[in-house]
């Protein structure tokens, strides 16, 4: 069993290394920013990310592209729920520094939990998305 887990971990590690999780990150950021825009947030505030959604994208146009590519990437983990969880954790960790305040972090986490389901995939049963202040080791 230990041997199997070790092989599984290695397989998951290589799967994660070949996955492009950026479209998932962009898709989720678009979602929470769209929600904020509808509550009066300035949609023209500058961003550090060259591929962050433009105000036009945030109104829905272009967002389906990030979602489609994101779902394709997550689909690669469908047979390995633990690895799917690792992918979600990686997305959370990669974006944690860009989330402003507890509210945005909770919102991002909520959307992230729903992501597999949105893609028509099984969501991992137990998946801790808390990011420790020191940051989780990314392999």
């Amino acid at each position: 069993r230990q041997q199997w887990e070790l092989q599984g971990d290695r397989r998951c590690q290589s799967q994660l290394e070949r996955a492009n999780l950026r479209p998932c990150e962009q898709h989720l950021m678009q979602k929470i920013q769209r929600d904020e825009d509808s509550y009066g947030r300035d949609p023209y505030s500058p961003s550090q990310d060259p591929y962050s959604p433009s105000p036009y994208d945030r109104r829905g146009a272009g967002s389906s592209q990030h979602q489609e590519r994101c779902c394709n990437e997550l689909n690669e983990f469908e047979n390995n729920q633990r690895c799917m969880c690792e992918a979600l954790q990686q997305i959370m960790e990669n974006q944690s520094d860009r989330l402003q305040g507890r509210q945005q972090e909770q919102q991002f986490k909520r959307e992230l939990r729903n992501l597999p389901q949105q893609c028509g995939l099984r969501a991992p049963q137990r998946c801790d998305l808390e990011v420790e202040s020191g940051g989780r080791d990314r392999y």
Partner: antibody, heavy 122, light 108 residues
Framework: QQLKESGGGLVKPGGSLKLCCKA?????????MNWVRQAPGKGLEWIGS????????YYADSVKGRFTLSRDNAQSTVCLQLNSLTAADTATYFC????????????????WGPGTLVTVSS | YVMMTQTPSSVSEAVGGTVTIYCRAS???????LVWYQQKPGQPPKLLIY???TRATGVPSRFRGSGSGTQFTLTISGMKAEDVATYYC?????????FGGGTEVVVK
């Protein structure tokens, strides 16, 4: 890092053909693969893509239901089965490796095969 | 289905001149999914620019990609004879991953 298509040739309308693309010099199972065709003197037409573990396969509307994409990671090969061929399918068929920028995320086709010519004529 | 329209279909420019190629998408395309390729006669396409503005490895700085939303541009500043080719834009965010019709660049 190389790709090489094979299987092209002359085929009659309504006929079938199987094109394959053999990869070398890189870990094939790490990459999504795509097929693009180009009719003589015309532009590029994307015809299909297959993800690393074959879990997601897409086709252009013009070939849907007639062409089938498959891959064998152990053999580092991606194949395209062409059925119900018409003169409109006459083209050079390219396979292309899809990669992405690890830091920022954009996808692109960075390695292409030289292409294989398919001629559909009676 | 995102349709990509390139203009002009052909352009003639003197060596040293500037060539501007436009690519219009029928709906908004994220910069992340906009790519430019160069194809010379008898050869497969070659990656030029990805992410709308990032030059691929080994691509000279005279090639510049810009734009966002539905309007994208490829500019060749200080055209060289070796730049004679057909240039294609492609969106690869939504399947089908469509190419523009191509722009043939020739030397005047």
């Amino acid at each position: 890092q190389q790709l090489k298509e094979s299987g092209g040739g002359l085929v009659k309308p309504g006929g079938s053909l199987k094109l394959c693309c053999k990869a070398s010099g890189f870990t094939f199972s790490d990459y999504n693969m795509n097929w693009v065709r180009q009719a003589p003197g015309k532009g590029l037409e994307w015809i299909g893509s297959i993800t690393r573990s074959s879990r997601t396969i897409y086709y252009a509307d013009s070939v849907k239901g007639r062409f089938t994409l498959s891959r064998d990671n152990a053999q580092s090969t991606v194949c395209l089965q062409l059925n119900s061929l018409t003169a409109a399918d006459t083209a050079t068929y390219f396979c292309a490796r899809e990669d992405f920028n690890v830091y920022t995320g954009p996808y692109y086709y960075d390695v292409w095969g030289p292409g294989t010519l398919v001629t559909v004529s009676s | 289905y995102v349709m990509m329209t390139q203009t002009p279909s052909s352009v003639s420019e003197a060596v040293g001149g500037t060539v501007t190629i436009y690519c219009r998408a029928s709906q908004s395309v994220s910069n992340m999914f906009l790519v430019w390729y160069q194809q010379k006669p008898g050869q497969p396409p070659k990656l030029l620019i990805y992410g709308a503005s990032t030059r691929a490895t080994g691509v000279p700085s005279r090639f510049r990609g810009s734009g966002s939303g539905t309007q994208f541009t490829l500019t060749i500043s200080g055209m060289k004879a070796e730049d004679v080719a057909t240039y294609y834009c492609q969106q690869n965010g939504n399947s089908p991953y469509t190419f523009g019709g191509g722009t043939e660049v020739v030397v005047k």
